[in-house]
């Protein structure tokens, strides 16, 4: 009987040691979790504040809906304009609607006045079709008025509230467009 009691006591002591070990592990785990939580919260706060501080468009760009626009301060031919936009992570302006056209022409009136600005529209040499740089055709209301009788390459530009066409090798200002950053706040 004494042996039986002694065995039970030993078993209980072993159990107690295991529980103490488990408690120690749990405390350690809890401390680790708290540290991780702290790190996660700090990371989240940093991310949120940087997202809050970063504007949807870069400096000197104008926002309208989900687009950012940059109006150049230099003249260049159409190809150089396209390259300049690409290097900024954008492309020459692609006008999707009358609303966008109105916004652009309204903004230009406020910023610069009545100058010529290249957009991302060019005429296919073979078919004579007008195409945006992504290969899509402009909507019927946004086809350039035929102003260019040039035998050379013909590209589209905006002046006042009109879309016009000209030899791609003439010098004009240009407008770049890219997606605005989505604010996650």
């Amino acid at each position: 009987k004494l042996l039986q009691v002694s065995t039970i006591a030993m078993q209980q002591q072993e159990k107690l040691i295991q529980q103490e070990r488990a408690l120690l592990n749990f405390t350690e785990w809890k401390r680790s979790c708290a540290l991780q939580m702290k790190y996660c919260q700090a990371f989240m706060q940093n991310s949120l504040s940087s997202a809050h501080n970063s504007s949807p468009c870069p400096n000197n760009w104008i926002q309208n809906r989900e687009s950012c626009y940059y109006v150049s301060e230099i003249w260049s031919i159409w190809h150089t304009s396209q390259e300049n936009c690409l290097k900024e992570g954008s492309t020459l302006l692609q006008i999707e609607s009358k609303e966008e056209m109105d916004f652009i022409t309204g903004s230009l009136r406020k910023i610069k006045g009545s100058y010529d600005y290249w957009v991302g529209l060019s005429q296919d040499g073979h078919s004579g079709r007008w195409l945006w740089q992504d290969g899509s055709s402009p909507s019927p209301g946004l086809l350039p008025a035929e102003r260019s009788q040039s035998a050379n390459q013909v590209c589209g530009y905006v002046k006042s509230n009109s879309l016009l066409s000209s030899n791609c090798s003439t010098w004009k200002y240009f407008i770049c467009e890219k997606y605005a950053l989505r604010s996650s706040v």
Epitope: W78, E83, Q133, Q153
Partner: nanobody
């Protein structure tokens, strides 16, 4: 990463022809401009010709009417057909590509026009 590999350079007599090729591989944005610059010894690098993803070309005045740029959009390859070559066309010809936030250059191919 984008890689540009040029080929087709060589020695040719004045009045002769050459066809340069430049193959682009890697992740290329759908809207881009590809083209050719050249650099003669002791001179600055100058634009020769370029072409958009939709095939709209543009030429330097010195080569207009003699050189023709074209591209195979599916193969991401740009070609420069050079006719009526002159000694002043002698240079290293570099292929380049401008994509979104990126500009890439090939290693260059030597073109020598001499009798």
């Amino acid at each position: 990463q984008v890689q540009l590999v040029e080929s087709g350079g060589g020695l040719v007599q004045p009045g002769g022809s050459l066809r340069l090729s430049c193959a682009a591989s890697g992740s290329i944005s759908s809207i881009n401009v590809m083209g050719w610059y050249r650099q003669a010894p002791g001179k600055e690098r100058e634009l020769v010709a370029r072409i958009t993803n939709l095939g709209l070309p543009n030429y330097a005045d010195s080569v207009e009417g003699r050189f023709t740029i074209s591209r195979d959009k599916d193969e991401n390859t740009v070609y420069l057909e050079m006719n009526t070559l002159k000694p002043e066309d002698t240079a290293v010809y570099y292929c380049y590509l401008v994509g979104l936030k990126a500009e890439y250059w090939g290693q260059g191919t030597q073109v020598t026009v001499s009798s």
